[in-house]
Each structure stands twice: as C-alpha cells, then as structure tokens.
C-alpha cells in the first residue's frame, strides 16, 4: 500500500455508507470503491502525476526552503460517478446511474 | 498566516525565479506571487473550500478511521496566468501575456 514514502498513486478505499451515516438515504450499494490518493509529490514530479506549472514551482521552492513551503499534494484530479439507489426528498427510492464525483479515476500532484 | 491548525486558505508565496533555477530562461519578472494553499480540511467542510463529493466522503471516513484514511488536502482548485518574458528555443526574448497555471486563484479541499 502507498505510504508516506511512496509516490502519489491511487489506492483502494472501500467505503461503507453505514460507517459515514449515509445509509439513511443511500439504499444501494451498501458499500463502494471510492479509492484514495496516497503518497508523496517528490522531486522530480513525474508525468504520470500530471503536475500543473504551479505544482512544479511549489516543488522546486520546497526543495530550496523545505521548512517554509510545503510539497504539492497528492489529490484526485479526475473523479468517476457511481450508480446509487437513494431516497429522494419525498422518501421515494430513486435510481441514479451517474452520481458524479464519488470515485477517484486519477490522482495527481497539485 | 495559515498553519496546520487553520482552515484551508490561500496564503502568500513570493517565488524568485533565481531560487528555483528558472532565471536561465525566464527573463522577467524576477519574482512573482504564486500563492500557496495552506491549512487543514476539517469536518465539516465549508462551502468556501468547494469540496467534491469524494472529499466529503473521505473526510467522513477519516473521522471514523483517522489512522486508516487521510483527510482531504488543501490544494489549488483554480489557477491564474502571469505575464512572462522568456527565452524561446532560439534564444529569442519572447513575451507571453498568458503563461497559464502559475498562480493560485482559489484553494479548496480535494
């Protein structure tokens, strides 16, 4: 698994809706693969973490002044939808095939 | 200034191109305001950090399993361009008014 010493990457994160109190309105699924972005944004930033120019600059400043400026952060740069069956405002079970922004598709350094 | 205990916000970060070794090709400016996103993404995530659904989910999982899952990260969510005078491949000083992605416009929790 990706620890603090490993490079920024997508790792598994199974989320159970009961654990986060969302089981009151999300009927299905009971759990899903959310993924998590873990690991460091170390110099030099590789192409696969799709760094912005600002992330590259911040990484270089961090190299020069590590106590003054933080590293760029490993975060989701692209998200995917999941299908959910949920209770709407009227309590009616409603199916949504594209409940956006729930699962990590790609991670990067920002 | 925004420390580890403060909420995610945009803070000043003056970058000198000589410090990062870019003065060999960026002629002007000598330095610029890059800004940095600093601070924590604490529960509950406020609207001003424009959290994605995944960031909200991850924050809730972190609350439940703080050692297993990290908090969302405070990162640039919108970047601005700066004007630069740089040496092109031919060594010709070239002015670009919109050198994209160099300065933070907005920070958020991702």
């Amino acid at each position: 698994s990706a620890g603090a010493g490993s490079h920024c990457q997508k790792t598994s994160l199974r989320v159970n809706f009961e654990d986060i109190g969302w089981d009151s309105w999300i009927i299905a699924p009971k759990e899903y693969e959310a993924y998590e972005c873990k690991g460091g944004c170390f110099f030099p930033l590789a192409d696969d973490v799709t760094p912005t120019k600002h992330a590259i600059v911040q990484t270089l400043v961090h190299l020069k002044f590590p106590t003054k400026v933080g590293k760029a952060c490993c975060v989701p740069t692209k998200l995917s939808p999941i299908s959910v069956l949920y209770k709407d405002d009227m309590g009616v079970p409603t199916l949504k095939y594209h409940y956006e922004g729930m699962s990590v598709a790609e991670c990067g350094c920002r | 200034s925004a420390g580890a205990g403060s909420h995610c916000q945009k803070t000043s970060l003056r970058v000198n191109f000589e410090d990062i070794g870019w003065d060999s090709w960026i002629i002007a400016p000598k330095e610029y305001e890059a800004y940095e996103c600093k601070g924590g993404c604490f529960f509950p995530l406020a609207d001003d950090v424009t959290p994605t659904k995944h960031a909200i989910v991850q924050t809730l999982v972190h609350l439940k399993f703080p050692t297993k899952v990290g908090k969302a990260c405070c990162v640039p969510t919108k970047l601005s361009p700066i004007s630069v005078l740089y040496k092109d491949d031919m060594g010709v000083p070239t002015l670009k008014y919109h050198y994209e992605g160099m300065s933070v416009a907005e920070c958020g929790c991702r």
């Epitope: - | 002007a28 400016p29 610029y32 004007s83 005078l85 010709v92 000083p93 070239t94």
Partner: antibody, heavy 114, light 107 residues
C-alpha cells in the same frame, strides 16, 4: 536574416480606410506576436495592438478599439493592420514590430488629407 | 493605462560624456521595461530589454538598471552615433505604453 517588409506609402481622404501589410521572413511567422506601433510627425511612439498569428486573436489599445482590425495570412507570413474612419490626426508612420520589439519594419507613411 | 515618464525630455552632451536618462512608471512593472534608440527617418532599435539585458549587437557602453517603478538608461561614454531620441517602454500590462522620449543632442 530576420526582417519585416511593409507596404508602401498611402494617401487617404478623411473617413476612408487604410490597410498596411507587413511581410515577415527569416523566422517562423507563427512563433511570435506581431505588434503595430505608430508615430505622428515629430511625436513619440504609440502602441496600437498586437495579433497572435497562430489563432489570430488580437489585443488592441483602448484608443483604437472599434477602428482598428489586425489580421494575418500565415500562408504568406504576412500581418495586416487596417484603420478605418481616418482623420487628419491619423497621419503618421505605421510600424510593425515582432513580439518583443526586437525586429521592426521600415515603416509605412499614411497621410490623411482632404 | 500605465504612464511612463521620462526625464529629461532633452539634453545636450559632448562626445565622451556619461549620459543618464531616467524613466518612471505610474505603477510597479517589475522588470518589464525596454529601451529604444531612434534616429530621424528610421525605425526604433531595441537597446535594452527586461530593464538590464543588453540586446545582441548593441555596444556595451549602453546599460540599463532598475526594477519596480524607477529605471535608468546609461551611456558610459557618448559616441557621435549615439545622438538620437531614446524611448522607454513598459510591457508589464497588456496595454503597452512608451515614454515621451528623450532627445540627446550635441553640445
């Protein structure tokens, strides 16, 4: 060598339009913005605007907005500056200049007279 | 627009003199400043870019300094071919502006 060659002198009546051309050679035309600058007799330099030859997007000085049009023909490495609704105060030498003003055309005298 | 103010507007000097022309911007322009020389009937010629960088082919007697709002063009030892009009120019803002010019004449 790198050079910009402009079209010849023009005499125009007030209210007319003029179109000045600037042909680039010795470098890749699309690599650099093209600026236009004018200079009235005995006066200083006045920037009019620039065109990015790649997309053709322009940035005009506020003073000339609505009267100036900058275009380009990449197939012949030529930039154009058209100024409409001419007045006597537009009598000037018009220059094209590459991106960072390191290379200038020889200038085109435009005389506006009735 | 950013105003560029040159001083003096004209000066008389002799061959061999050290000449200094100043340029002040109405707001900070970092080092986005250029200096040009113009002779009668000719197009301007770039001398200095980014406040202090000498353009290729320009004699080393020309130098530039400054940052922010105050800038200087110095000719260390005036030569006969240096009698001309000199302009400063800011390129910081997308609306580019020139100074009004400084005429360097023979004393």
């Amino acid at each position: 060598q790198v050079q910009l060659v402009q079209s010849g002198a023009e005499v125009k009546k007030p209210g007319a339009s003029v179109k000045v051309s600037c042909k680039a050679s010795g470098y890749t035309f699309t690599s650099y913005y093209m600026n236009w600058v004018r200079q009235a007799p005995g006066q200083g330099l006045e920037w009019m605007g620039w065109i990015n030859p790649v997309q053709g997007n322009t940035n005009y000085a506020q003073k000339f907005q609505g009267r100036v049009t900058m275009t380009r023909d990449t197939s012949i490495s030529t930039a154009y500056m058209e100024l409409s609704r001419l007045r006597s105060e537009d009598t000037a030498v018009y220059y094209c200049a590459r991106n960072y003003f390191d290379v200038w055309g020889q200038g085109t005298l435009v005389t506006v007279s009735s | 627009d950013i105003q560029m103010t040159q001083s003096p507007s004209s000066l008389s000097a002799s061959v061999g003199d050290r000449v200094t022309i100043t340029c002040r911007a109405s707001q900070t322009i970092s080092n986005f400043l250029a200096w040009y020389q113009q002779k009668p009937g000719k197009a301007p010629k770039l001398l200095i870019y980014a406040a202090s960088n000498l353009q290729s082919g320009v004699p080393s007697r020309f130098s530039g300094s400054g940052s922010g709002t105050d800038f200087t063009l110095t000719i260390s030892s005036l030569q006969p071919e240096d009698f001309a009009v000199y302009y400063c120019q800011q390129l910081y803002a997308e609306s580019i502006t020139f100074g009004q010019g400084t005429k360097v004449e023979i004393k």
